[in-house]
Amino acid sequence: GITIPRNPGCPNSEDKNFPRTVMVNLNIHNRNTNTNPKRSSDYYNRSTSPWNLHRNEDPERYPSVIWEAKCRHLGCINADGNVDYHMNSVPIQQEILVLRREPPHCPNSFRLEKILVSVGCTCVTPIVHHVA
Amino acid sequence: GITIPRNPGCPNSEDKNFPRTVMVNLNIHNRNTNTNPKRSSDYYNRSTSPWNLHRNEDPERYPSVIWEAKCRHLGCINADGNVDYHMNSVPIQQEILVLRREPPHCPNSFRLEKILVSVGCTCVTPIVHHVA
């Protein structure tokens, strides 16, 4: 990895678990300044592997609300608007970081957690797997 | 929202910016116990809207490495294996949370940041927009 010199103005950590426990400013900086939310807002409907979005809420997590994609069909939509079952609609999943309140119900203490979320669906050609 | 009683065993915060600055344990808890990584590992190749994965590295960010999807074609792959330009390959994007070192180069002080990443691609039917 790249070695970066430590900034002398860094806050000190008096936590015995340092560097595992760090200070995090929850004032979110949003880098997505040049994105148009309308762009992909209707892909879930227009895709050949359309999906529905389900709300997953957990007050012990930050962010507390995450939207999960569920593919609408087993197959994919063909040019005639029918479902083709020799293709598969499959969820595209991504591991994301969230903050989990730890100990539970604490407003100012969290632990990083990795969760797998389905972001949308794509259409794939199934392949055969031979079991000996 | 749901009101949760504060746990009396919560650590105290002496930071003047509380509750904006919180303690976070970086010992990641992985919730993805029942997932099989073989599942979606080759969707990028088998999809009708295939994509390539590009490595985005930033040592000032946690996680420092993020993989970005870039659709391979403007169109989608048809049953004959050719690119059909009546359809569009589009990236499925998701806003994710990352930790940005703040002040820069500090090992134990971060700020939450929202970034938009492309997770994969899906095939959509283009829509015609008539300008009056």
Epitope: L74, S89, V124, V128, H130, V131 | N36, S40
Partner: antibody, heavy 123, light 107 residues
Framework: EVQLVESGGGLVQPGRSLRLSCAAS????????MHWVRQAPGKGLEWVSG????????GYADSVKGRFTISRDNAKNSLYLQMNSLRAEDTALYYC????????????????WGQGTTVTVSS | EIVLTQSPATLSLSPGERATLSCRAS??????LAWYQQKPGQAPRLLIY???NRATGIPARFSGSGSGTDFTLTISSLEPEDFAVYYC?????????FGQGTKLEIK
Amino acid sequence: EVQLVESGGGLVQPGRSLRLSCAASGFTFDDFAMHWVRQAPGKGLEWVSGINWNSGSIGYADSVKGRFTISRDNAKNSLYLQMNSLRAEDTALYYCAKDIAAAGEFYFDMDVWGQGTTVTVSS
Amino acid sequence: EIVLTQSPATLSLSPGERATLSCRASQSVSSYLAWYQQKPGQAPRLLIYDASNRATGIPARFSGSGSGTDFTLTISSLEPEDFAVYYCQQRSNWPPTFGQGTKLEIK
């Protein structure tokens, strides 16, 4: 040895319920979609239902939709078929079968079959 | 749903002979057709998938051909264990459907 063993069949009155089970062994169960296929006495084969590796995609034949529920427990290497509101025409030998597709998806061709369990719906 | 019609209903042949079984679809199923063999008291066994691909462990004497609506299963030289009922199955349209079967019996 790759094996599927069905159980839970029996004689049941019309309108009642039955739950079939299928125990899988000899292969990585959660790598594959699974199916139920039935065969009425002296008749041909009829696909009943299918489920992908993580229960995220499920399909049913119109003849059983709303009455039958397919499910799986990957931790137990088991497939299930909950059959409610049974009718005389549901009388058949029920087979559990493994899909040939990789990655737990659907190909709808089946390369491993159990020996079947008999369901008889009669008053 | 797609209807698969198999012919003949019964085929009487002797060991060593060539068997030709036919399956016709009510509409095109491209090459998404499979063949199964079922012996009395046994479960079906996958022989051919995608019209012409032999499944694992299936002897070379079994071959499949065709596309669209007309398909053929050929057994080049019949062995005593080949006498059984054969089913075709399509996976092109919902729901997957089977033909009514062809019984291959010893003459």
